[in-house]
Amino acid sequence: KAMHVAQPAVVLANSRGTASFVCEYASPGKATEVRVTVLRQADSQVTEVCAATYMMGNELTFLDDSICTGTSSGNQVNLTIQGLRAMDTGLYICKVELMYPPPYYMGIGNGTQIYVIDPEPCPDSD
């Protein structure tokens, strides 16, 4: 059975450079340990933005210096990416791995195009 991962096609970051989206996966089995990775695809290059491994029912824990935060609820992961700038506009792919128990499954979403617009600088006040 293939594992399907769904994510929104387009998300617009807010004025503070924060973008949130839901990554939902159709689990073929009863996973207890899940790893979620956010990847950015620019041209044909893929880089890791952030990753978290969590036990079902527990909170996602990203590294301290991660630009991502998130929460999980069943087969849904609510992801938030912070500190984005216009140059970070691109396709953000959600990858889900069911690490335990066997069998292992991996699924990849089609990607969320995140648009980031840098705020206009405030005009000088006299």
């Epitope: 059975k1 293939a2 990775t37 990847l39 890791e48 292992y104 991996m106 699924g107 990849i108």
Partner: antibody, heavy 118, light 108 residues
Framework: QVQLVESGGGVVQPGRSLRLSCAAS????????MHWVRQAPGKGLEWVTF????????YYADSVKGRFTISRDNSKNTLYLQMNSLRAEDTAIYYC???????????WGQGTLVTVSS | EIVLTQSPGTLSLSPGERATLSCRAS???????LAWYQQKPGQAPRLLIY???SRATGIPDRFSGSGSGTDFTLTISRLEPEDFAVYYC?????????FGQGTKVEIK
């Protein structure tokens, strides 16, 4: 650039043990899952075993389960394969391979030959 | 376990001809989870196609992948001398990771 270099192959008698190593360089080793794949002489590719990022999760082909053990040392950027109770049918070139971000095996080592013979 | 069956076992063609290689899965494979590899004698396999149709870095555009579900195809539009090799399909969406038995593309 990404490099994977296997070592430890050789000729060994049936029932004996051998430990293969795969030295990784050119990338952040702990951010990638890794595999061993083997190829018997003149045959196709056979997946052998997988290890997760931190070494906590391991999966094995039925043909090696209970005999082979995969491990990794992220501080040394090295992947290992401990092979016990070797059989003639384990004779093969053993490759280590890196899982790319999107799942395929994007980099492979040059392989190390293991020959099990009396 | 997902069994991958490749056909034909051997393909005899001349340089400049088109090669069409087939890979059939015993159950559904997500299109994001199928790859093709090329292997030449004495060398390690090299990733050609991932996600069923995306070319790996440095792979020429004469190589293309297609398909979904259980039927996948690797096409080499015009065979170059260096393309004569063995080609393997692989699914990487679930354990155990599995490969097809390979298709040998040889010079006619």
């Amino acid at each position: 650039q990404v490099q994977l270099v296997e070592s430890g192959g050789g000729v060994v008698q049936p029932g004996r043990s051998l430990r293969l190593s795969c030295a990784a360089s050119g990338f952040t080793f702990s951010h990638y899952t890794m595999h061993w794949v083997r190829q018997a002489p003149g045959k196709g590719l056979e997946w052998v075993t997988f290890i997760s990022y931190d070494g906590h999760n391991k999966y094995y082909a039925d043909s090696v389960k209970g005999r082979f053990t995969i491990s990794r040392d992220n501080s040394k950027n090295t992947l290992y394969l401990q092979m016990n109770s070797l059989r003639a049918e384990d004779t093969a070139i053993y490759y280590c391979a890196r899982t790319g971000w999107l799942g395929p095996f994007d980099y492979w080592g040059q392989g190390t030959l293991v020959t099990v013979s009396s | 376990e997902i069994v991958l069956t490749q056909s034909p076992g051997t393909l005899s063609l001349s340089p400049g001809e088109r090669a069409t290689l087939s890979c059939r899965a015993s159950q559904e494979v997500g299109e994001s989870e199928l790859a093709w590899y090329q292997q030449k004698p004495g060398q390690a396999p090299r990733l050609l196609i991932y996600g069923a149709f995306s070319r790996a870095t440095g792979i020429p555009d004469r190589f293309s992948g297609s398909g979904s579900g259980t039927d996948f195809t690797l096409t080499i539009s015009r065979l170059e001398p260096e393309d004569f090799a063995v080609y393997y399909c692989q699914q990487y969406g679930s354990s155990p990771w599995t490969f097809g038995q390979g298709t040998k593309v040889e010079i006619k």
